[in-house]
């Protein structure tokens, strides 16, 4: 689809004549009829093919023809096709003479013909005029033309249709020949594909615009070159998406379980050393003058009970000072001015004589100590109670009360996380230090086997393109349900792309 | 425990800023993106913005483009979300939360109500 | 953006009651799906990820399934404790999108 335009620029009838040499009256009001149409080693009259087109009265005599001159005309006058340009043309130009208004050939008489010029031949199209110059005995025209493509019509015959656009069906404009040229940061047959950030990873990432980089399912990052770790993962790395690799001092499915408790949480306080002893399980070890499970309490010098037959203990800067109740004297209360005439045992102690009635010893019931059974024995002063667990006094016993994960009189020994068969199906328990882990069977998952699976072929991500993976049941391996546009046992292959 | 606790939010006018902060316990904060999703009073959910763990890449949906700014402080555990030039719309309230536009959104703070009103 | 409808936007039940919960994508979202549950006055918690991955805690009550562009939330057994608006996210394409909502009450 194009136009041929003509240019018509000067016409010249000095004498005012038509074609049959009779003088125009009172002048020549002269337009013009075009006719044109395909070519013709001798231009015949006939049909115009490629089409036809008339002016207004555009001067009298002769004239010079202004562009779009004024009078309702065009100038260039428009030849409009909508087919293929062939190549070759044959132009018909008539001048006639306008007695009145009317210009329709039938209005008219055939001798109102002023002259008639016809040439033919080869023209391409371009941008460029062509000029000629027709000359008959007594009148001259000057003129130009050219065949141009209409609007989104390109290559060398006008039949090359190419709209641009920027939308979502493509981003481009189009080159002289009808070929799409891309705008920046598309690519594609139609430049319908953007181009990603440089760098983006060619299977982890994708765009739907220029420079932008979005991840797939599993990959963050710039680039999308990094892994997101699993959804449950709390202290953990991944290399491969939804993977949880534990951190130093973690353990565990998702690696929330603490195995350094006392460098992540430091318990122990006033300077106590402190020593992991299992899954969020510690051991303080005081130093002198505290005491506590978290070394938290301060000691006085008094806590040691030194003031002996119910002497009352003193905390002073440099110690402590006993003062001793009546009948006792010496730095702890240890010596007597009494007697067992004095009745100086307590809690239903019984009193012995010595030294002649000098002195006295008394003979403690069970659960009382101290040279008068004033104090009541602490069987937990000794901490025989190991990893953590804590001594309470019973009557005449001790008893320790074991942390999670102990057990035994003295929390000695470690509790078995596998006693209590955790692993269903069948499944394998391991005790490890961090916890217990199932190994499960094949057809179950999950952390304690309770989840029923098919092998899972598709675990590997051996689909590519964004296939779709299933597993098949019957013989455990995968099958790829490829998106339109690839093939192959993985979608690894663009449609029309085979393997190399 | 996974603890998610969000801070900052308030009564702003229109064209307004304001900084939330998010501060994060019970996992190792610098392996993880973040997210912030809103919820407009009576409304459903909606993804505002995420960054990725270690190279902090942000991600934002189109209305909040050029106004909303993630960030993160790997050493202080903490996500920010900074609002610039706030519309009525931005109204919500604004939660802190471990995920990645590509992944679900595994733990939430509580939440923090932002309120834009004249 | 892809756009997630939940239906039914509301629904009443029973303890006991097993309950269906539907979403549907505006295009092929694979299995990148999940289920969140939110209370009043609460923030979301994520029950199934995956399509059908129970998450870390959550009662194997909940159960998730689907692919491709229709996925279903089922509660076999209603607890007291599960009346609440549950949504579910597409995580496929970008950006994230979630459905509006259905909120289960009690019959």
């Known amino acids: 689809s194009g136009v041929f335009q003509l240019q018509l620029q000067e016409f010249v009838n000095e004498r005012g004549v038509l074609a049959s040499g009779r003088p125009c009256e009172p002048g020549c009001r002269t337009f013009f009829r075009v006719c044109l149409k395909h070519f013709q080693a001798v231009v015949s009259p006939g049909p115009c093919t490629f089409g036809s087109v008339s002016t207004p009265v555009l001067g009298t005599n002769s004239f010079a023809v202004r562009d779009d001159s004024s009078g309702g005309g065009r100038n260039p006058l428009q030849l409009p096709f909508n087919f293929t340009w062939p190549g070759t043309f044959s132009l018909i130009i008539e001048a006639w003479h306008a007695p009145g208004d009317d210009l329709r050939p039938e209005a008219l008489p055939p001798d109102a013909l002023i002259s008639k010029i016809a040439i033919q031949g080869s023209l391409a199209v371009g941008q460029n005029w062509l000029l000629d110059e027709q000359t008959s005995t007594l009148t001259r025209l000057r003129y130009s033309y050219r065949v141009i493509c209409s609007d989104n019509y390109y290559g060398d015959n006008c039949s090359r249709l190419c709209k641009k656009r920027n939308d979502h069906f493509g981003h481009y404009v189009c080159q002289p020949d009808g070929n799409l040229s891309c705008l920046p940061g598309w690519t594609g047959e139609y430049c319908q594909q953007p181009i990603c950030l440089s760098g983006c990873h060619e299977q982890n990432g994708y765009c739907s615009k220029p420079a932008e980089c979005l991840c797939r399912p599993g990959w963050q990052g710039r680039l999308c070159n990094e892994c997101i770790p699993h959804n449950g993962c709390r202290h953990g790395t991944c290399s491969t998406p939804w993977q949880c690799t534990c951190d130093e001092g973690w353990g565990g499915l998702f690696c929330d379980q603490d195995l350094n408790y006392c460098t992540h949480h430091s318990p122990c306080k006033n300077g106590a050393t402190c020593s992991n002893s299992g899954q969020r399980s510690y051991t303080c070890t005081c130093r002198p003058g505290y005491t506590g499970v978290d070394c938290e309490l301060e000691l006085s010098e008094c806590d040691s009970n030194p003031c002996r037959n119910g002497g009352s203990c003193k905390d002073q800067e440099d110690g402590y000072h006993c003062l001793c109740p009546p009948g006792y004297y010496g730095l702890h209360c240890e010596h007597s001015t009494l007697s067992c005439a004095d009745s100086p045992c307590f809690n239903g102690g019984s009193c012995r004589e010595r030294n002649q009635g000098a002195s006295y010893a008394c003979e403690c019931p069970p659960n009382f100590t101290g040279s008068n059974c004033e104090k009541k024995v602490d069987r937990c002063t000794s901490n025989p109670c190991a990893n953590g667990g804590q001594c309470l006094n019973r009557g005449p016993s001790r008893m320790c009360r074991c942390r999670p994960g102990f057990t035994g009189t003295y929390c000695e020994r470690h509790v078995s996380d596998c006693a209590r068969n955790p692993c269903a199906h069948g499944g394998t328990c391991h005790d490890l230090e961090s916890g217990l882990m199932c190994t499960c069977p094949a057809g179950f998952s999950g952390r304690r086997c309770e989840v029923r699976t098919s092998i899972d072929a598709c675990a590997s991500s051996p689909c590519f393109n964004r296939a779709t993976c299933y597993t098949d049941l019957s013989t455990d391996t995968f099958v790829c349900n490829c998106p339109y546009g690839f093939v192959g046992s993985r979608c690894e292959f663009p449609v029309g792309l085979p393997p190399s | 425990e996974v603890q998610l606790v969000e801070s900052g939010g308030g009564l702003v006018q229109p064209g307004g800023s304001l900084r939330l902060s998010c501060a994060a316990s019970?996992?190792?904060?610098?392996?993880?993106?973040m997210a912030w999703v809103r919820q407009a009073p009576g409304k459903g959910l909606e993804w505002v913005a995420t960054i990725s763990s270690s190279d902090a890449w942000p991600s934002y949906r189109d209305s909040v483009k050029g106004r909303f700014t993630i960030s993160r402080d790997n050493a202080k555990n903490s996500l920010y979300l900074q609002m610039n030039s706030l519309r009525a719309e931005d109204t919500a309230v604004y939660y802190c939360?471990?995920?990645?536009?590509?992944?679900?959104?595994?733990?939430w703070g509580q939440g923090t109500l932002v309120t834009v009103s004249s | 953006d892809i756009q997630m409808t939940q239906s039914p936007s509301s629904l009443s039940a029973s303890v006991g009651d097993r309950v269906t919960i539907t979403c549907r994508a505006s295009e092929d979202i694979y299995s990148n799906l999940a289920w969140y549950q939110q209370k009043p006055g609460k923030a979301p918690k994520l029950l199934i990820y995956d399509t059908n991955n129970l998450a870390d805690g959550v009662p194997s009550r909940f159960s998730g399934s689907g692919s491709g562009t229709d996925f279903t939330l089922t509660i076999s057994s209603l607890q007291p404790e599960d009346f609440a608006t549950y949504y579910c996210q597409q995580y496929n394409n970008y950006p994230p999108t979630f459905g509006q909502g259905t909120k289960l009450e009690i019959k």
């Open positions: 939360s471990r995920g990645y536009y590509n992944s679900p959104f595994a733990y």
């Open positions: 019970g996992f190792t904060f610098r392996h993880f993106p």
